[in-house]
Interface confidence: low
């Protein structure tokens, strides 16, 4: 079935590469384990940024190396990627899937456009 | 190397019960984004889901057969059971357990199957 | 319970024939279909997932397309180990199932 998934349109990364945005999934029954996926899409490309399972109540697991962190409250998940640079801007896509209990409910949002600008290096001091 | 191997089949009684395994390597029952479905397959018929159990122990059963079926695992043997009650004839199958990935729930590890005969 | 529909039931085929089955489901599935070879005392063997994706280490004359209700598994060229039964099965809502199976055998 399909679910509702909101994302805002467009985020500016920090100087740090840091972006964060909110994904938020109408929720049409009571999930108890939740699976939340980013993809990039640039160039009608699609790839896969990070993924994570999690009960309701509990804190987003992503794997140790991946440039994804995230908490959860109600039904809104709380998206910080890291280590972004200029050549990352893209569409950034939230992708919820509720696992558990069936039925199980799938929803794609239509995308965060998350510009990253690499700041300016620092002139050399005399 | 993924591997399933389940055992415990053979020829039980009308009204009985039985208790297959299932027993995993190569990967662990709990890891998240992975669940282990329980199918069977009565001789010379199609495949039928029996239920499945998620990586975070919560499970899943047919509501046809959900008062006489109990899939648990046990993390510490990296095992997974069903048990299955008040058997009748139509219960003779051979038993398969498979693995799939939450990414996309293709079943993409299975065991060899147990064959159970139901049967006075 | 969503409902799967294989056609046909069986087919007689010969070697470097191309194979057409399909799968219709009773409701819209997305694309959360895969399809399953099994031949005779062995269990299944997973083909296509995501109704289109080819699993590794299978041969690419094994393809999948469809969304939705219609589904496709294609054998471009039919080889001598591919004459087994097929299943194809949803996994968009449990309980998850199964087609009846498409049996392809020897002309």
């Known amino acids: 079935k399909a679910m509702h998934v909101a994302q805002p349109a467009v985020v500016l990364a920090s100087s740090r590469g840091i972006a964060s945005f909110v994904c938020e999934y109408a929720s049409p029954g009571k999930a108890t384990e939740v699976r939340v996926t980013v993809l990039r899409q640039a160039d009608s490309q699609v790839t896969e940024v990070c993924a994570a399972t999690y009960m309701m109540g509990n804190e987003l697991t992503f794997l140790d190396d991946s440039i994804c962190t995230g908490t959860s409250s109600g039904n809104q998940v709380n998206l910080t990627i890291q280590g972004l640079r200029a050549m990352d801007t893209g569409l950034y896509i939230c992708k919820v899937e509720l696992m558990y209990p069936p039925p199980y409910y799938l929803g794609i949002g239509n995308g965060t456009q998350i510009y990253v600008i690499d700041p300016e290096p620092c002139p050399d001091s005399d | 190397e993924v591997q399933l191997v389940e055992s415990g089949g053979g020829l039980v009684q009308p009204g009985g019960s039985l208790r297959l395994s299932c027993a995993a390597s190569?990967?662990?029952?709990?890891?998240?984004?992975?669940?282990v479905g329980w199918i069977r397959q009565a001789p010379g018929k199609g495949l039928e889901w029996i239920g499945e159990i998620y990586h975070s122990g919560s499970t899943y059963y047919p509501p046809s057969l959900k008062s006489r079926v109990t899939i648990s695992r046990d993390n510490s043997k990296n095992t997974l059971y069903l048990q299955l009650n008040s058997l009748r004839a139509e219960d003779t199958a051979v038993y398969y357990c498979?693995?799939?990935?939450?990414?996309?729930?293709?079943?993409?590890?299975w065991g060899q199957g147990t064959l159970v005969t139901v049967s006075s | 319970d969503i409902q799967l529909t294989q056609s046909p039931s069986s087919l007689s085929a010969s070697v470097g024939d191309r194979v057409t089955i399909t799968c219709r489901a009773s409701q819209d599935i997305r694309k959360f279909l895969a399809w399953y070879q099994q031949k005779p005392g062995k269990a299944p063997k997973l083909l296509i997932y995501?109704?289109?994706s080819l699993e590794s280490g299978v041969p690419s004359r094994f393809s999948g397309s469809g969304s939705g209700t219609d589904f496709t598994l294609t054998i471009s060229s039919l080889q001598p180990e591919d004459f087994a039964t097929y299943y194809c099965q949803q996994s968009y809502r449990s309980p998850r199932t199964f087609g009846q199976g498409t049996k392809v055998e020897i002309k």
């Open positions: 995501d109704a289109s």
């Open positions: 190569g990967f662990s029952l709990s890891t998240g984004g992975v669940g």
């Open positions: 498979a693995r799939y990935e939450y990414s996309s729930y293709g079943l993409d590890y």
